[in-house]
Amino acid sequence: LRQEDFPPRIVEHPSDLIVSKGEPATLNCKAEGRPTPTIEWYKGGERVETDKDDPRSHRMLLPSGSLFFLRIVHGRKSRPDEGVYVCVARNYLGEAVSHNASLEVAILRDDFRQNPSDVMVAVGEPAVMECQPPRGHPEPTISWKKDGSPLDDKDERITIRGGKLMITYTRKSDAGKYVCVGTNMVGERESEVAELTVLE
């Protein structure tokens, strides 16, 4: 044991991440120690394979100790990158384990669970359209477009709650083509068009 040697300590812990499929990502980890500690990453108790194990890996162990993903791999069934990670720094005097960091993958499916249906109402009657956006993480927010433009939800007659668009009393000018839009950090998806017909 050399007098100036000391066991590892984590000086930068990884943080939770939400990343879109196919995008690059970095889980940071920095450790001090003498001799300089080696860094390994673990996910769900299993050591993470990096370019140090296989040069073709999409995960790289950076000189700093951070784990860099060239692109996040995530499918409907295969999800090798999602999970809870820790980095472990080791030298001959011991080891230090970082805080847990979760890597979540943001997704937005293509298919609406419910497309809005055409509605026909008389002037002054209430109108309701309903949609369920594609599954997504984070949960997609819902907005509506009328004739290709964002719907003016400042109009006190119009309420958007969950997937429901409610117009308390319709005017002739409300008639048109409506589209439900689901949005999260991945992007946006538009439903099929639903026609609102307002009869005199």
């Epitope: 299993e46 993470v48 995530h74 499918g75 409907r76 069934k77 295969s78 090798p80 990158d81 298919d111």
Partner: antibody, heavy 118, light 105 residues
Framework: EVQLVQSGAEVKKPGASVKVSCKAS????????MHWVRQAPGQGLEWMGW????????EFPQKFQGRVTMTRDTSITTAYMDLSRLRSDDTAVYYC???????????WGQGTMVTVSS | DIVMTQSPSSLSASVGDRVTITCRAS??????LNWYQQKPGKAPKLLIY???SLQSGVPSRFSGSGSGTDFTLTISSLQPEDFATYYC???????FGGGTKVEIK
């Protein structure tokens, strides 16, 4: 190198069972869904089901429910497909295939010929 | 169950020809459609995933298009090594088309 290596050819009698193994190497076994696909002589590809190697959860089309069992041993990165009550029309080449993060079968085993004959 | 209908079931073509194979799903599968090539006695090989993305290492003469229910695999200029059977597969719930055998004219 990412690869799937399957067990050797089998000859079975009608009514018997067969267990085919698929040894994965070169990737994180628990991270990728494993599917089984079969191909009768001169016929097309038929999907038999899949297993989530992390959880062991399986899913099969109606046709194979009750007759097929899929398991895995994560300690030796191997998936297994067990087909029971064999009939002559189960004679086929059986493939394991890894599903990529792009929802496609990017890596296939070499295939295992199973012959069912009395 | 989603049924995948591939056409034609077989075709004859010459080296240099442009070849088109179609695949129709019985309901919308968005872009969850893959194409495979299989040669006798070999395992299938992935060519195209997500309807139009070329798998790494696959020649650029192969291309895919379509979304929803109708999809196409195109070989822009058929090469001798392309004579094989081609399968579409939907990964929405998983099933294969019946295959298209590309033979030498």
């Amino acid at each position: 190198e990412v690869q799937l290596v399957q067990s050797g050819a089998e000859v079975k009698k009608p009514g018997a069972s067969v267990k085919v193994s698929c040894k994965a190497s070169g990737y994180t076994f628990r991270g990728y869904a494993m599917h089984w696909v079969r191909q009768a002589p001169g016929q097309g590809l038929e999907w038999m089901g899949w297993i989530n190697p992390r959880s062991g959860v399986t899913e099969f089309p109606q046709k194979f429910q009750g007759r097929v069992t899929m398991t895995r041993d994560t300690s030796i990165t191997t998936a297994y497909m067990d087909l029971s009550r064999l009939r002559s029309d189960d004679t086929a080449v059986y493939y394991c295939a890894r599903e990529s993060g792009d929802d496609a079968f990017d890596i296939w085993g070499q295939g295992t010929m199973v012959t069912v004959s009395s | 169950d989603i049924v995948m209908t591939q056409s034609p079931s077989s075709l004859s073509a010459s080296v240099g020809d442009r070849v088109t194979i179609t695949c129709r799903a019985s309901q919308s599968i968005s872009s969850y459609l893959n194409w495979y090539q299989q040669k006798p006695g070999k395992a299938p090989k992935l060519l195209i995933y997500a309807a139009s993305s070329l798998q790494s290492g696959v020649p650029s003469r192969f291309s895919g298009s379509g979304s929803g229910t109708d999809f196409t695999l195109t070989i822009s200029s058929l090469q001798p090594e392309d004579f094989a059977t081609y399968y579409c597969q939907q990964s929405y719930s998983t099933s294969f088309g019946g295959g298209t055998k590309v033979e030498i004219k």
